[in-house]
Interface confidence: low
């Protein structure tokens, strides 16, 4: 039943491109060369991309031709290295053409960067897009995947995929309609935070398979299977499991191509076998391949059985416990895994990893015990305070959030963080904290039975944000020490963090709080972050400020912009009054 | 890989007896309660009887209680299912899986009970 043994093909970019169809196969290999070469310029791309078109074609022509037989990363990597700036644009990148496969690909993928320097997406006026639109919808939709490839390097390309087709259908309908931008512009708006939370989702998987392996991958996965299809059996689970690995295996490593053909192939599996796996799955399959598999990753967790058994009996009371755990280890605890998370859809992933990580470490030590069933019979009552953590940790923070909305609930993460991580750039900070802080809005109105699933796994992805970008410039120990200790323990890692007592505050730098009547005319979002910026540095010059401190001294900030803003002389106001402010807040803060 | 082979199934007359067995591998048998679950043609998979992984507790749907007995072989790493004083509607195709799941992950085994 493995849906991925296939026969040997005599040429793989024939046998891909026949299976994808031209289109697709043109869209991924555009998304694998801008995530690659993420400076390169669109038409640069759209040529190699042409090319390699051009040469599968002869291939599908006869497989017997030359160099069709050779490997995908052969023919990518090869086309990569033709590019004439690779030295000067990349610099120690071009080293890699220096290499054989695999090492040239994976010198590829280790050059991959996860804060490209370049300019942030300004959005055109929506009849410029419009006619930009109509005028070459082919160049315009092959720009959005570029566009958002390269500024999103490990981001799912079949899910990119079908992110650009939903682009096309907002311009496509948008564009006729009688207010053009009050039909596109939410749906846009819509497209990048989803965007966003997808190019997040994945960059988790990839960094859980390429820091932590193909075990600690494959034990999320059977948690996360297990919640959403109860019902399944855990051969069926494990299948599911199996394929989904080489599927993220196959995108995180550049193998765009295998990748999405087969998501396709999964996809098409779990619907044919939606009676063994779940009752929640009839409208995903009837819909087209790219909706149907968004579909199914997002699909809602199917009801539990009715009267499953204790756990107790097969985990803890057998006298076999050790005997079967020996057998077969990891066999055991997937099993363990699978029947704990398909009892608790109300437990995050993580927190059922560490239950079975506790599980584990327990039955190495007492299968080791004179008397192992003594040792481990208690081993459930370990679980309570791991359970009761992220359960008390996210009701005091969602009482925070309902206390002080959003925006001041950023604030005292922001707050919070740079106390803990003071080194971390400032910008790092702000991204990192105000998604953090968006954890309330998304998981606070849920029940009690959801919010730990959607607070804890949803801070595990924006934490993860935040380990890529200090992976690039390491700057602080902990933050280190956090990131790469255990993966399911990032999360209690940073929360268990104090106040940094052995951080030298920043010199005082008027500079970085001398504001501009340009405030004025950014959106809300842009001026929260501004404010959001100013907190950090304030925070950075003085750690030990307290909240009311720094409560006052941003009141006195918010009310200078907005009596500023409303000034006739914008500018010579922000001059003046920002001198007093600065003065003010030194005082305040005791700089 | 987790393989469990069903075996046993037939044709058989109303009122007459079937044993079923359930060849597991790919697993530690003995750490597990196992099920049997049939799927009747035109209907969904119905949940027959369940056993722990000791073989000390039984469960029965109310359907078959009195009729049907659960039991396993950990030695030899199979699942039993001793059925009696078969009815028509017993016709099933019948599956035996992990824990108590009502989905199939096996080929199952086909019982016929004509009246």
């Known amino acids: 039943r493995g849906v991925f043994r296939r026969d040997a093909h005599k040429s793989e970019v024939a046998h891909r491109f026949k299976d994808l169809g031209e289109e697709n196969f043109k869209a991924l290999v555009l998304i694998a060369f801008a995530q690659y070469l993420q400076q390169c310029p669109f038409e640069d791309h759209v040529k190699l991309v042409n090319e390699v078109t051009e040469f599968a074609k002869t291939c599908v022509a006869d497989e017997s031709a030359e160099n069709c037989d050779k490997s995908l990363h052969t023919l990518f990597g090869d086309k990569l290295c033709t590019v004439a700036t690779l030295r000067e644009t990349y610099g120690e990148m071009a080293d890699c053409c220096a290499k054989q496969e695999p090492e040239r690909n994976e010198c590829f993928l280790q050059h991959k960067d996860d804060n490209p320097n370049l300019p942030r997406l300004v959005r055109p006026e929506v009849d410029v897009m419009c006619t930009a639109f109509h005028d070459n919808e082919e160049t315009f939709l092959k720009k959005y995947l570029y566009e958002i490839a390269r500024r999103h390097p490990y981001f799912y390309a079949p899910e990119l995929l079908f992110f650009a087709k939903r682009y096309k259908a907002a311009f496509t309908e948008c564009c006729q309609a009688a207010d053009k931008a009050a039909c596109l512009l939410p749906k846009l708006d819509e497209l990048r935070d989803e965007g966003k939370a997808s190019s997040a989702k994945q960059r988790l998987k990839c960094a859980s398979l390429q820091k932590f392996g193909e075990r600690a991958f494959k034990a999320w996965a059977v948690a996360r299977l297990s919640q959403r299809f109860p019902k399944a059996e855990f051969a069926e689970v494990s299948k599911l499991v199996t394929d989904l690995t080489k599927v993220h295996t196959e995108c995180c490593h550049g193998d765009l191509l295998e990748c999405a053909d087969d998501r396709a192939d999964l996809a098409k599996y779990i619907c044919e076998n939606q009676d063994s796996i779940s009752s929640k799955l009839k409208e995903c399959c009837e819909k087209p391949l790219l909706e149907k598999s968004h579909c199914i990753a997002e699909v809602e967790n199917d009801e539990m059985p009715a009267d499953l058994p204790s756990l107790a009996a097969d985990f803890v009371e057998s006298k076999d416990v050790c005997k079967n755990y020996a057998e077969a280890k990891d066999v055991f605890l997937g099993m363990f895994l699978y029947e704990y998370a398909r009892r608790h859809p109300d437990y995050s992933v993580v927190l059922l990893l560490r239950l079975a990580k506790t599980y584990e470490t327990t039955l190495e030590k007492c299968c080791a015990a004179a008397d192992p069933h003594e040792c481990y019979a208690k081993v459930f009552d370990e679980f309570k305070p791991l359970v009761e953590e992220p359960q008390n940790l996210i009701k005091q923070n969602c009482e925070l959030f309902e206390q002080l909305g959003e925006y001041k609930f950023q604030n005292a993460l922001l707050v919070r963080y740079t106390k803990k991580v003071p080194q971390v750039s400032t910008p790092t900070l702000v991204e990192v904290s105000r998604n953090l802080g968006k954890v309330g809005s998304k998981c606070c109105k849920h029940p009690e039975a959801k919010r730990m699933p959607c607070a804890e796994d949803y801070l595990s992805v924006v934490l993860n944000q935040l380990c890529v970008l200090h992976e690039k410039t390491p700057v602080s120990d902990r933050v280190t020490k956090c990131c790469t200790e255990s993966l399911v323990n990032r999360r209690p890692c940073f929360s268990a963090l104090e106040v940094d007592e052995t951080y030298v505050p920043k010199e005082f730098n008027a500079e970085t709080f001398t504001f501009h009547a340009d405030i004025c005319t950014l959106s809300e979002k842009e001026r929260q972050i501004k404010k959001q910026t100013a907190l950090v540095e304030l925070v950075k010059h003085k750690p030990k400020a307290t909240k009311e401190q720094l409560k006052a001294v941003m009141d006195d900030f918010a009310a200078f912009v907005e009596k500023c803003c409303k000034a006739d002389d914008k500018e010579t106001c922000f001059a003046e009054e920002g001198k007093k402010l600065v003065a003010a807040s030194q005082a305040a803060l005791g700089l | 890989e987790v393989q469990l082979v069903e075996s046993g199934g037939g044709l058989v007359q109303s009122g007459g007896s079937l044993r079923l067995s359930c060849a597991a591998s790919g697993f530690t048998f003995g750490s597990f309660g196992m099920s049997w679950v049939r799927q009747a043609p035109g209907k969904g998979p119905e949940w027959v009887s369940a056993?722990?992984?000791?073989?000390?507790?039984?469960r029965y749907a109310e359907s078959v209680k009195g009729r049907f007995t659960i039991s396993r072989d950990n030695a030899k790493k199979t699942l039993y299912l001793q059925m009696n004083s078969l009815k028509p509607e017993d016709t099933a195709v019948y599956y035996c899986t992990i824990g108590q799941s009502t989905s199939r992950g096996s080929q199952g085994t086909q019982v016929t009970v004509s009246s």
């Open positions: 056993i722990d992984g000791g073989g000390a507790d039984t």
